[in-house]
C-alpha cells in the first residue's frame, strides 16, 4: 500500500543530487588550492545532515552549521560582488574579473547553485517528487534557509567597497524581498564596509535613462545610509560592452561611458 506523501508546490530534489554535490565539490577543490584540504564526502555528510529526516518546513540556520564549518572559506573581503535578479551577468563578470567573487564563486555557493533539495520528516528519504515553495508552502524550507545562511555569512564577511549588480529591466530594480534586499543589505557590517556601489544594468539598447534615480534605488540608498554606509550608483548602459571592456580594458572604445 503506497504511504501517504506530502505533495509540495515546488519542484522536487534535483535528480542525482548527492552525486552532483560530490562531483561539484571535487571539481571545486581541485581548481582552488586553498580548499584542497576539504574532504568532499564529509561535506556531503554535513549537507545531508542538514535536511534529511527533518520536516522540510522546519529547517533552521542551526541545521546548516556543520556544513558552514566545513565550507569555511576566506575570500578577499574587498572583492565581493553581490547581485539581485541578474545572476548570469554577475557570474560572467567574475569569470573575467577573476579577483572578484560572487557567492556562487565560493565552495558552498558553487555546490548548491541552481539545485533543489528536501527530505521528509522521520524518514531518511530524499524527496525527488516535490519540495516546498517559498511563497506557496513555507519559507523555512531547506533551499531557502541554505541561501539565507550562506548569503548572511557572505555579506558579513564583506569590507571596504562592496559592489552589487542590479537588474534595471525589472519593475523593482531594488526589491526588499529579494535575498539581497532582505538578507545581504542588512548584514553588511558598517564598521568594515565603507561604500556599497550599485551597478544598474540596462536591458534595452536605446535605454539612456538614469536608472540610479529610480525610486527603488533611492530606497536602497536610504536603507544603506541609515546603516552608516556610503552609497554610490552607476548605470551600465551596455552590459555587452561592459563585459568586453572588462576583458580588454585597453580597447579605445572603453574610455567612454558604458
Amino acid at each position: 500500500v503506497p504511504r501517504w506523501r506530502q505533495q509540495w508546490s515546488g519542484p522536487g530534489t534535483t535528480k542525482r543530487f548527492p552525486e552532483t554535490v560530490l562531483a561539484r565539490c571535487v571539481k571545486y577543490t581541485e581548481i582552488h588550492p586553498e580548499m584542497r584540504h576539504v574532504d568532499c564526502q564529509s561535506v556531503w555528510d554535513a549537507f545531508k545532515g542538514a535536511f534529511i529526516s527533518k520536516h522540510p518546513c522546519n529547517i533552521t540556520e542551526e541545521d546548516y552549521q556543520p556544513l558552514m564549518k566545513l565550507g569555511t572559506q576566506t575570500v578577499p573581503c574587498n572583492k565581493i560582488l553581490l547581485w539581485s535578479r541578474i545572476k548570469d551577468l554577475a557570474h560572467q563578470f567574475t569569470q573575467v574579473q577573476r579577483d572578484m567573487f560572487t557567492l556562487e564563486d565560493t565552495l558552498l555557493g558553487y555546490l548548491a547553485d541552481d539545485l533543489t533539495w528536501c527530505g521528509e520528516f522521520n524518514t531518511s528519504k530524499i524527496n525527488y517528487q516535490s519540495c516546498p515553495d517559498w511563497r506557496k508552502d513555507c519559507s523555512n524550507n531547506p533551499v531557502s534557509v541554505f541561501w539565507k545562511t550562506v548569503s548572511r555569512r557572505f555579506a558579513e564577511a564583506a569590507c571596504d567597497v562592496v559592489h552589487v549588480m542590479l537588474n534595471g529591466s525589472r519593475s523593482k530594480i531594488f526589491d526588499k524581498n529579494s535575498t539581497f534586499g532582505s538578507v545581504e543589505v542588512h548584514n553588511l557590517q558598517p564598521e568594515k564596509v565603507q561604500t556599497l556601489e550599485a551597478w544598474v544594468i540596462h536591458g534595452g539598447r536605446e535605454d539612456s535613462r538614469d536608472l540610479c534615480q529610480d525610486p527603488t534605488i533611492k530606497e536602497l540608498e536610504s536603507i544603506i545610509s541609515k546603516r552608516n554606509i556610503q552609497f554610490s550608483c552607476k548605470n551600465i548602459y551596455r552590459p555587452d560592452k561592459f563585459l568586453q571592456c572588462v576583458k580588454n580594458p585597453e580597447d579605445s572604445s572603453c574610455t567612454s561611458e558604458i
Partner: antibody, heavy 120, light 111 residues
C-alpha cells in the same frame, strides 16, 4: 596493478585488542574511500567500517561501534582497523577494500584477507 | 537478518539464464543509492561484478548484467557456465543506518 595487502590478524583472547593494517599500491590512495569487510566462517559478508578519502568521515556497523576505530595514513598509503574489547563473534576473515571513489558506491578492489580468531 | 534480502540459493544448467534478486527499502535501494554486486568463488576474496546498478568493470563478461527498480535490484547471468558457481552478494548504502549493507548472499549452483 592495484593491490591491497592486509596484515595484523591472529589469535587473541576475548576482551583483547588487535590492529589490522592494509598496505595499498597501484592507485592514488588519497583519492579513494576505503572499507573493512569481514566474513565469519561459513557466513556471508558483513561490512565493518569505512573511511572517506581524506579521513574526514568515518562509518561503523552497529556491531562494532565504540569498539573498533578505522583510520588511514595517506602519506604511507595505509589503512588501519584498531579493534578492542574483542568478542568471539568478531572471529572472521577481515578484508580491506578500495571503494569506488565514495564510500556510498561500494568496493571495487579487495585484498586477500587476514584471519582474526578470538578465543580463550 | 540482513537489511537486503536475497534468496539463499539459485541454480541453473549450463547455457541457461539465471536471475538473483535483492530486495531493500526506501532507506537504501529506494533512496537513489547505487547497488553493487559481488561474486565470491570458493576460498577466494570477493570480486566486483556490477557497480552503479548496471555498470560492469573491465574484465567482467557481458553475460553479467544488473538492473534496479524501486526498492529492488537484480543480477542476471546469461549463458551460465560451470565457473559461475559461487556466492553472489548485493550491496548498497543505507541512509537510515548511515552504513553500507550487504544481502545475505545467494549460493549459485550450476547443475
Amino acid at each position: 596493478e592495484v593491490q591491497l595487502l592486509e596484515s595484523g590478524g591472529g589469535l587473541v583472547q576475548p576482551g583483547g585488542s588487535l590492529r589490522l593494517s592494509c598496505a595499498a599500491s597501484g592507485f592514488l590512495f588519497d583519492d579513494y574511500g576505503m572499507s573493512w569487510v569481514r566474513q565469519a566462517p561459513g557466513k556471508g559478508l558483513e561490512w565493518v567500517s569505512a573511511i572517506s578519502y581524506k579521513g574526514g568521515s568515518t562509518y561503523y556497523a552497529d556491531s562494532v561501534k565504540g569498539r573498533f576505530t578505522i583510520s588511514r595514513d595517506n602519506s604511507k598509503n595505509t589503512l588501519y582497523l584498531q579493534m578492542s574489547s574483542l568478542r568471539a563473534e568478531d572471529t572472521a576473515v577481515y578484508y580491506c577494500a578500495k571503494d569506488h571513489k565514495w564510500n556510498y558506491y561500494g568496493m571495487d578492489v579487495w585484498g586477500q584477507g587476514t584471519t582474526v580468531t578470538v578465543s580463550s | 537478518q540482513s537489511v537486503l534480502t536475497q534468496p539463499p540459493s539459485a541454480s541453473g544448467t549450463p547455457g541457461q539464464r539465471v536471475t538473483i534478486s535483492c530486495s531493500g527499502s526506501t532507506s537504501n535501494i529506494g533512496n537513489d543509492n547505487y547497488v553493487s554486486w559481488y561474486q565470491q568463488l570458493p576460498g577466494t576474496a570477493p570480486r566486483l561484478l556490477i557497480y552503479k546498478d548496471d555498470q560492469r568493470p573491465s574484465g567482467v563478461p557481458d553475460r553479467f548484467s544488473g538492473s534496479k527498480s524501486g526498492t529492488s535490484a537484480s543480477l542476471a547471468i546469461s549463458g551460465l557456465q560451470s565457473e559461475d558457481e559461487a556466492d553472489y552478494y548485493c550491496g548498497t548504502w543505507d541512509d537510515r543506518l548511515n552504513a553500507w549493507v550487504f544481502g545475505g548472499g545467494t549460493k549459485l549452483t550450476v547443475l
